[in-house]
């Protein structure tokens, strides 16, 4: 049974030209975190696996960074990032959960960080 | 290519023991999770067992548990399902497959090898 | 466990037939649903996953929808090599399950 949440940070918003972090967190479940995959609309940007590392894949290599933890840094960023992130849990003996950010990169210096919130 | 090539399959005696291997070439073997899946003559798949790429990770169906154990040597490309106390129900074709590296499906699966289990 | 149920379990269609398969899940799966195809004494191949998406190298008349519970896999025009067995299988928890199968068979 899934008793886990996954809180993320939720709506936010960034400069263009400048980084942001995506952050989830996996709570009130003991599961194992097998691997975590970081998604942008379905294209597949970054894997960390609990055995081997991260993995980044190539067409977003110059920009993403791993981590913190098991969140992702954009870099660079650009009117286009704009859009829905998720993060993708993959957990045993829970199975998957999944959380969402969106990501709203702004022209201006009015970039202001939304409130942290909840996905069961 | 792809490739992943099952053997280690035959007819065992109920309670008796037999160890899969499957031999894997054409990609980073190491970089993937691996997992067993079978199939009983003229039924269904059913997944077995399922090991991360370091190794570090086993998961087993329930009717398995405690009498499989799933490995791998990452230096031989090859992985491995040892299989004890085997009973009738366990008779299937056992595959072995590669995951994709996002963990969504498995994406390639060897040609199966039989295993009979029957006085 | 989450029970994966397909329907039909067998079809008979015609060469250039569009043909839909169905697959109900017991719960909320999301989108983690995959669909292989397999023939006789062979290994299951991938063609689905992640609900909609095409695994490399599938012809594009193979294309799948839906999220939560329904889910679809669609031949737009049936070829002389579809015919086979379909499996859908999902991967939102443990134990991995696959539906029955559905045959597909020359009318």
């Known amino acids: 049974m899934m008793t886990g949440t996954i809180e993320t940070t939720g709506n936010i918003s960034a400069e263009k030209g400048g980084s942001i972090i995506l952050q989830c967190h996996l709570s009130s479940t003991t599961a194992q975190v097998t691997q975590v995959n970081w998604e942008q609309q379905d294209q597949l940007l970054a894997i960390c696996n609990a055995d081997l590392g991260w993995h980044i894949s190539p067409s977003f290599k110059d920009r993403v960074a791993p981590g913190p933890g098991l969140g992702l840094t954009l870099q660079s960023l650009t009117v286009n990032d704009t859009g829905e992130y998720f993060c993708i849990y993959h957990t045993y003996p829970d199975g998957t959960y999944t959380g969402r950010i969106f990501l709203e990169v702004l022209e201006s210096s009015v970039a202001e960080h939304g409130a942290r919130f909840q996905i069961p | 290519e792809v490739q992943l090539v099952e053997s280690g399959g035959g007819l065992v005696q109920p309670g008796g023991s037999l160890r899969l291997s499957c031999a894997a070439s054409?990609?980073?073997?190491?970089?993937?999770?691996m997992s067993w899946v079978r199939q009983a003559p003229g039924k269904g798949l059913e997944w077995v067992s399922t090991i991360s790429g370091g190794g570090t990770n086993t998961y087993y169906a329930d009717s398995v548990k405690g009498r499989f154990t799933i490995s791998r040597d990452n230096s031989k490309n090859t992985l491995y399902l040892q299989m004890n106390s085997l009973r009738a129900e366990d008779t299937a074709v056992y595959y072995c497959?590669?995951?994709?590296?996002?963990?969504?499906?498995?994406?390639?699966w060897g040609q199966g090898t039989l295993v009979t289990v029957s006085s | 466990d989450i029970q994966m149920t397909q329907s039909p379990s067998s079809l008979s269609a015609s060469v250039g037939d569009r043909v839909t398969i169905t697959c109900r899940a017991s719960?909320?799966?999301?989108?983690?649903l995959s669909w292989y195809q397999q023939k006789p004494g062979k290994a299951p191949k991938l063609l689905i996953y992640k609900a909609s998406k095409s695994h490399t190298g599938v012809p594009s008349r193979f294309s799948g929808s839906g999220s939560g519970t329904d889910f679809t896999l669609t031949i737009s025009s049936l070829q002389p090599e579809d015919f086979a067995t379909y499996y859908c299988?999902?991967?939102?928890?443990?134990?991995?399950?696959f539906g029955q199968g559905t045959k597909l068979e020359i009318k």
């Open positions: 054409g990609f980073t073997f190491s970089s993937y999770i």
């Open positions: 497959a590669k995951w994709l590296l996002s963990y969504y499906a498995m994406d390639y």
């Open positions: 719960q909320n799966i999301n989108v983690w």
């Open positions: 299988q999902q991967g939102q928890s443990y134990p991995y399950t």
